[in-house]
């Protein structure tokens, strides 16, 4: 849960009560017991961007 | 150059109460969070408790949960351990240090340690 | 708690010797591994975090590798100031930072 008076994270990010931040849902894969990865659950990852056409 | 600085260590009786502090200096302390890290004589490392940066968030190694309180005071640029029921097992050299910028990742300054012996 | 478990527990080697400590998980840690040492009397001083990557202002004689469970630490060439105990931490089971039991490196 975000604390009060926080501006929302950005979308494929989510807030950290143990670092007072938006961290990177990305980083979950690789460490899933991070606070602010239930916030991650929650919402879905920014969507993917091909890196061509 | 950064410091930490830890006193408030000393003797105390089984059961009895002690407040470490530990004094930053020479860098910006609220964005960071702290912990306390500990090692019993002869023995190895030991983390204790861990501080968000505002202080709203704290965690504590089983062995302490109940007992021990950290908390920080950022104007004061000073880290506290509120350490109640003490038990022999807690004799230890106390140390202070500051966590990474990321997630839990590393200790990258520590102070000099503070004993505490608790003893009848 | 994740157990660390290091390996040896002492050492006994010359300057100049190449040291090798390993530390392994006892669960998968990804990269979550950081090397410190310590002399007697003073506070731990971080050598290596994320398993290889070396702390500013620590000599380039120090590496750290692995991934998964097993690390290692290596010092290419001892130097006199490098007698002291090693310690690998995880932290990747955060909150529950955990620390290895350490590694006495002697003179021989």
């Known amino acids: 849960e975000q604390a009060p008076g926080q501006a929302p994270c950005s979308r494929g990010s989510s807030w950290s009560a143990d670092l007072d931040k938006c961290m990177d849902c990305a980083s979950c894969r690789a460490r899933p017991h991070s606070d602010f990865c239930l916030g991650c659950a929650a919402a879905p990852p920014a969507p993917f961007r091909l890196l061509w056409p | 150059e950064v410091q930490l600085l830890e006193s408030g260590g000393g003797l105390v009786q089984p059961g009895g109460s002690l407040r470490l502090s530990c004094a930053a200096s020479?860098?910006?302390?609220?964005?960071?969070?702290m912990m306390w890290v500990r090692q019993a004589p002869g023995k190895g490392l030991e983390w204790v408790s861990y501080?968000?940066?505002?202080?709203?968030?704290?965690h504590y190694a089983d062995s302490v949960k109940g007992r021990f309180t950290i908390s920080r005071d950022n104007s004061k640029n000073t880290l506290y351990l509120q350490m109640n029921s003490l038990r022999a097992e807690d004799t230890a050299v106390y140390y202070c240090?500051?966590?990474?910028?990321?997630?839990?990742?590393?200790?990258?300054?520590w102070g000099q340690g503070t004993l505490v012996t608790v003893s009848s | 708690d994740i157990q660390m478990t290091q390996s040896p527990s002492s050492l006994s080697a010359s300057v100049g010797d190449r040291v090798t400590i390993t530390c392994r998980a006892s669960?998968?840690?990804?990269?979550?591994l950081n090397w410190y040492q310590q002399k007697p009397g003073k506070a731990p001083k971080l050598l290596i975090y994320?398993?290889?990557s070396l702390q500013s202002g620590v000599p380039s004689r120090f590496s750290g590798s692995g991934s998964g469970t097993d690390f290692t630490l290596t010092i290419s060439s001892l130097q006199p100031e490098d007698f002291a105990t090693y310690y690998c931490?995880?932290?990747?089971?955060?909150?529950?930072?955990?620390f290895g039991q350490g590694t006495k490196v002697e003179i021989k």
């Open positions: 501080i968000s940066p505002s202080g709203g968030s704290t």
């Open positions: 669960q998968s840690i990804s990269s979550y």
């Open positions: 994320a398993a290889s």
């Open positions: 240090a500051r966590g990474g910028d990321t997630y839990f990742d590393y200790f990258d300054y």
């Open positions: 931490q995880q932290s990747y089971s955060t909150p529950g930072i955990t």
């Open positions: 020479g860098f910006t302390f609220s964005p960071y969070p």
